[in-house]
C-alpha cells in the first residue's frame, strides 16, 4: 500500500531527525497529502523557511556555528515581508546578529549563504554601517527609527538568529 | 556533531596523483553536507570540493575543476577527494569539513557554513 510504505518512510525520517531536533512541527503543503513541510519545534516560519531566536549571547562566529551545528545559518533577509515577520519575536531591548559580515573591512558585505548583497534590500539604521573596524551585521530597535540594522565589533557577544529551509519529509 | 579523520596525504612529484580520505564517526554520516578545503602556507584557507549528503550534488573551485573529484560512500562513513595532475601550487593542508543538511542536493561552499572539522592532511608537491 503506496499510503502505508510513505507513513513508515516519514516516521523513519522523524525518528532519524530527532537526534538533532526532538520535536517537529508538520503542516501538510496543498492538498497532496505526500508533501509535509516541518520546522523543529518551537523555531516559527514564514513561507518556505524555519527561524530560531537563539538567547544565548555569544560571538558571531560561534552564533554562526550554534546555527550550523542545527543545520542552519545566521538569518539572511531577503524581502522587507521577511524582516517584519522576524521582528514580531524579537525583544526591543536586545540585539541579534543576522547572516552578514564584512570581513575584510572594505565595505564588501556579504551573507553568510552567498546571497548577492543588494544594497536595495537593507534596511540600515540612518547613519549606519559608520566603522569599517564594525565587520558584523545585527538588527536592533531604535525608538526613533523602530528595527533596523547595525555594524558592530564581531567578538562582541549578542544573541542571534537561525534561519533554515523548511524540512520536508 | 561527528569526528572527522583525513588520511592520504603526502609527497608526491608534479604530474602524479593523491586519493585523500575523510573517514567520519558520530552521528548519522548520512545526514551531513561534506567539503574539502585546503590551506598552504601563508595563504587563508580556501574552498576545494563540495557534496551534498545524497551525493546526488557536487561543486568545485575554479582551481579543482577537471583534475579533482569528491565522491562519497555514506556506508563506509567516508569522503574522498582523487586529485590528479598534482601541481606544485595543490600544495596545502587539505581539510574535510562537515555540516548538517536535510537537503539531499543541498552542497556548501563557504567554511563558515561548516560546523565539524578534521585535523588536516598534509599534500606536498615537488617539481
Known amino acids: 500500500n503506496f499510503m502505508y510504505s510513505k507513513t513508515v518512510k516519514r516516521l523513519s525520517k522523524l525518528r532519524e531527525y530527532q537526534q538533532y531536533h526532538p520535536s517537529l512541527t508538520c503542516v501538510m503543503e496543498g492538498k497532496d497529502i505526500e508533501d509535509w513541510s516541518c520546522c523543529p519545534t518551537p523555531w516559527t516560519s514564514f513561507q518556505s523557511s524555519c527561524y530560531f531566536i537563539s538567547t544565548g549571547m555569544q560571538s558571531w562566529t560561534k552564533s554562526q556555528k550554534n546555527c550550523s551545528v542545527m543545520g542552519a545559518d545566521l538569518v539572511v533577509i531577503n524581502t522587507r515581508e521577511e524582516q517584519d515577520f522576524i521582528i514580531q519575536n524579537l525583544k526591543r531591548n536586545s540585539s541579534y546578529f543576522l547572516g552578514l559580515s564584512d570581513p575584510g573591512g572594505r565595505r564588501h558585505w556579504q551573507w553568510v549563504d552567498q546571497t548577492p548583497y543588494n544594497e536595495n534590500v537593507t534596511f540600515w539604521h540612518s547613519g549606519e554601517p559608520n566603522n569599517l573596524d564594525e565587520r558584523c551585521a545585527i538588527i536592533n530597535f531604535r525608538s526613533s527609527e523602530e528595527w533596523g540594522w547595525n555594524d558592530i565589533h564581531c567578538h562582541v557577544p549578542q544573541k542571534s538568529i537561525c534561519k533554515m529551509k523548511k524540512i520536508y519529509i | 556533531q561527528v569526528q572527522l579523520q583525513e588520511s592520504g596525504g603526502g609527497s608526491v612529484q608534479a604530474g602524479g596523483s593523491l586519493r585523500l580520505s575523510c573517514a567520519a564517526s558520530?552521528?548519522?554520516?548520512?545526514?551531513?553536507?561534506m567539503g574539502w578545503f585546503r590551506q598552504a602556507p601563508g595563504k587563508e584557507r580556501e574552498f576545494v570540493a563540495t557534496?551534498?549528503?545524497?551525493?546526488?550534488?557536487?561543486d568545485y573551485a575554479d582551481s579543482a575543476k577537471g583534475r579533482f573529484t569528491i565522491s562519497r560512500d555514506n556506508a563506509k562513513k567516508t569522503v574522498y577527494l582523487q586529485i590528479n595532475s598534482l601541481k606544485t601550487e595543490d600544495t596545502a593542508v587539505y581539510y574535510c569539513?562537515?555540516?548538517?543538511?536535510?537537503?539531499?542536493?543541498?552542497?556548501?561552499?563557504?567554511?563558515?557554513?561548516?560546523?565539524?572539522w578534521g585535523q588536516g592532511t598534509q599534500v606536498t608537491v615537488s617539481s
Open positions: 557534496i551534498s549528503k545524497s551525493g546526488s550534488s557536487t
Open positions: 569539513a562537515a555540516r548538517l543538511s536535510f537537503d539531499n542536493t543541498a552542497f556548501y561552499t563557504s567554511a563558515i557554513r561548516y560546523s565539524d
Open positions: 558520530g552521528r548519522t554520516f548520512s545526514d551531513y553536507a
